[in-house]
Structure formats: structure tokens, C-alpha cells
């Protein structure tokens, strides 16, 4: 009976995710039979979030919204170890905008989903950000400096990442 | 080649206002803010403040503020300044200056002398 | 605001020599620092930017350096043409500031 009234409020869990998410991949996390996480597929996952490439070419805000109508928002880097594993899916010829961006120009960088902006946890290439007039972030790759971040222009299109919190059942 | 064309010298007077042009050339003028910069006579550069020419807004020197007004008009890719309750210290070159890559004002405009007299 | 010191205001040299300029910045700039040749007709150009790198057309007699608070401007093998007053500027922080300027005459 346990078992059925939790298999019950999963299936009605998934179902809210279903408009946006058909497919879930699932695993269980630890022994507890009664934990799963979920991202959807074919997003990657990382610690307690997922991950997904936008591939079409947007600016910042048809980006954001993009990511939005998934459940997730541009992607927000806490850490390097987080950044090392985004990096692993991009592709080096290519620039993926993030979640930060600088509204007023007045290099007041801040992250989407309000997280505070720390000075000491960026990845800017040597010399960025160095625009008042670029006031959106990307991440791309330097062949003097690998993966790093680059202030650029709002409305020039790019390709993105979203990230979202994983979806526990 | 890039080019920034000032309107011409102006006298006013005390309490009055004065609205300044900076027409830009050679360039996409909303690709880059439009700075300006005041010089009094033997005196050094002082930063005024700067406008987005692609989003409109503006940031400026807290000393600047509630004298001078920035806004651009895209369609004749000019920028204008207009300082309002001009007193004799006001008195200065007005320059315009594009914004560039590294915190920089890379192109600048000849300069407008604006003199404040009764 | 960050306050930036030319500490010479005017400087006197020969055609021919190597001329150095300094700022000094009262907090550190982190290499945002940009160097303007202002003419006596007062055209402003700008030289150098982000503290050593050379602006489109400037000639290679002029040179950029520092770190920090502390940055110079050199001119080796002064021309006549290099009579001017010469700025610095720092972009790390709004309100930019220039320094107070260094008039640089001919002997």
C-alpha cells in the first residue's frame, strides 16, 4: 500500500514535468530504493543539476526565455570543477552564452537567478570583461588560455547553456 | 574612416541651457556608447559621463548629474548633450568620444567650446 | 573616485630623445590604464590602451608600461610632431579619471 501511494504521487510528479520534458532519465541515488533524480533527456547531469546545449543561434534574452520555457534558466557557474564538466559537451569553434550579464553597464555583473556575483569564483579570459557596451557573458575558448569567460555584445545571436535543479521522485 | 563631427562653438548665458551634437561616421553607431568629456581652459579632462547608443540609457559622474542630459538619435547617428543651469564655470571644450574595447574612448570629436557670459 | 597623479606637469626635451611620462593611480587599476595625445589646436588622440597596447596609426616610437598604481608613458627618438600634452586615464572603476596632464615642449 506504502509502495503504491508513492508510485502514485511519482507518476503525478512526472506528469507536471511532461509539458516541457516527455523524457526523464532517472537514477537512484544512494541505497534508499525511494530516491531517484531525474533530468530530462537528453540533458547531462552534474551534482544536483542538469544541463543542456542550445544549439540555435539566440541573443541573450531569446536565450533566457528559451531556457525558461524548459523550467531552467541560462546556466549560473559556482565552481570550476562545475565549469570542467560544462566544457566537456561544448564545442571548441563555438561560443555558448551564460547567465550573467552586466543590465546598466556599469560592471555590475549579476547572475540570473540572483546569486551573488563573486569576484573570486570568475572565469574571465585575460583582459575581460573590457566593454561597457558588451554587457552580456559567453564562454569560449582561447587557444592561449583554454575555456574562459568573454563580455560580448546582448543582441549578436549565440549558442547557450541552460541549467535547471535536478527533478527529485 | 571614423569620424566624429561636434556642432560649432556657442556663448550663453548665466541660468540658460545649451544642447551640444556629436555626429558619428565611418562606423555602426549603435555598436558603441558615445562618452563626453569637458575641459576647462588650462585645465586637465574631466569624464562627464557615457550613453548606450544601442539601449538609450546613461551613466553619469555623480558631479554631473542634474546639469547634464545625454540622449542619441539613431536614424541621424548623432549623439547630443545638453547642460542645463549654465553658470560661468561651465565655461569648457566639450568633447565626444566613442566608447572601445578595453575601457577606452579610442576616437574623439574636435571639440565644442560652449562660453557662458552675460 | 580613483584620484590619478602625473606628478610632472611639464617636461622639457630634445629632438631625439627618449622621453618618459608617469601616472600613478591611488588604488590599483588592474591595467586599465590608457594613455591621450591632446595637440595645442586641441585635437585629443588616443596612444596607448589597457597600459601597452598601441592605438590603429600610432608610431612605434611610443611605448606603454606598469602594473598596479604605477604606469609610463615613453617616447624614444622625440619628433617634433610629439609636442603635446599627454593624459592618462583609468577605465577599471566609474567615473573614469584622467590625470592632471604633462605639457611636453622642445628645448
Known amino acids: 500500500n506504502f509502495m503504491y501511494s508513492k508510485t502514485v504521487k511519482r507518476l503525478s510528479k512526472l506528469r507536471e514535468y511532461q509539458q516541457y520534458h516527455p523524457s526523464l532519465t532517472c537514477v537512484m541515488e544512494g541505497k534508499d530504493i525511494e530516491d531517484w533524480s531525474c533530468c530530462p533527456t537528453p540533458w547531462t547531469s552534474f551534482q544536483s543539476s542538469c544541463y543542456f546545449i542550445s544549439t540555435g543561434m539566440q541573443s541573450w534574452t531569446k536565450s533566457q526565455k528559451n531556457c525558461s520555457v524548459m523550467g531552467a534558466d541560462l546556466v549560473v557557474i559556482n565552481t570550476r570543477e562545475e565549469q570542467d564538466f560544462i566544457i566537456q559537451n561544448l564545442k571548441r569553434n563555438s561560443s555558448y552564452f551564460l547567465g550573467l550579464s552586466d543590465p546598466g553597464g556599469r560592471r555590475h555583473w549579476q547572475w540570473v537567478d540572483q546569486t551573488p556575483y563573486n569576484e573570486n569564483v570568475t572565469f574571465w579570459h585575460s583582459g575581460e570583461p573590457n566593454n561597457l557596451d558588451e554587457r552580456c557573458a559567453i564562454i569560449n575558448f582561447r587557444s592561449s588560455e583554454e575555456w574562459g569567460w568573454n563580455d560580448i555584445h546582448c543582441h549578436v545571436p549565440q549558442k547557450s547553456i541552460c541549467k535547471m535543479k535536478k527533478i527529485y521522485i | 574612416q571614423v569620424q566624429l563631427q561636434q556642432s560649432g562653438a556657442e556663448v550663453v548665458k548665466p541660468g540658460a541651457s545649451v544642447k551640444i551634437s556629436c555626429k558619428g561616421s565611418?562606423?555602426?553607431?549603435?555598436?558603441?556608447?558615445m562618452h563626453w568629456v569637458r575641459q576647462a581652459h588650462a585645465k586637465s579632462l574631466e569624464w562627464i559621463g557615457v550613453?548606450?547608443?544601442?539601449?538609450?540609457?546613461?551613466n553619469y559622474n555623480q558631479k554631473f548629474k542634474g546639469k547634464v542630459t545625454m540622449t542619441v538619435d539613431t536614424s541621424s547617428s548623432t549623439a547630443y548633450m545638453e547642460l542645463s543651469r549654465l553658470r560661468s564655470d561651465d565655461t569648457a571644450v566639450y568633447y565626444c568620444?566613442?566608447?572601445?574595447?578595453?575601457?577606452?574612448?579610442?576616437?574623439w570629436g574636435q571639440g565644442t567650446l560652449v562660453t557662458v557670459s552675460s | 573616485d580613483i584620484q590619478m597623479t602625473q606628478s610632472t606637469s611639464s617636461l622639457s626635451a630634445s629632438l631625439g630623445d627618449r622621453v618618459t611620462i608617469t601616472c600613478q593611480a591611488s588604488?590599483?587599476?588592474?591595467?586599465?590604464l590608457n594613455w591621450y595625445q591632446q595637440k595645442p589646436d586641441g585635437t585629443v588622440k588616443l596612444l596607448i590602451y589597457?597600459?601597452?597596447r598601441l592605438h590603429t596609426g600610432v608610431p612605434s616610437r611610443f611605448s606603454g608600461s606598469g602594473s598596479g598604481t604605477d604606469y609610463s608613458l615613453t617616447i624614444s627618438n622625440l619628433d617634433q610632431e610629439d609636442i603635446a600634452t599627454y593624459y592618462c586615464?583609468?577605465?577599471?572603476?566609474?567615473?573614469?579619471?584622467f590625470g592632471g596632464g604633462t605639457k611636453l615642449e622642445i628645448k
Open positions: 568620444a566613442r566608447n572601445g574595447n578595453f575601457y577606452v574612448m579610442d576616437y
Open positions: 565611418g562606423y555602426t553607431f549603435t555598436d558603441y556608447s
Open positions: 550613453i548606450s547608443t544601442y539601449y538609450g540609457d546613461s
Open positions: 588604488q590599483d587599476i588592474s591595467n586599465y
Open positions: 589597457y597600459t601597452s
Open positions: 586615464q583609468q577605465g577599471n572603476t566609474l567615473p573614469w579619471t
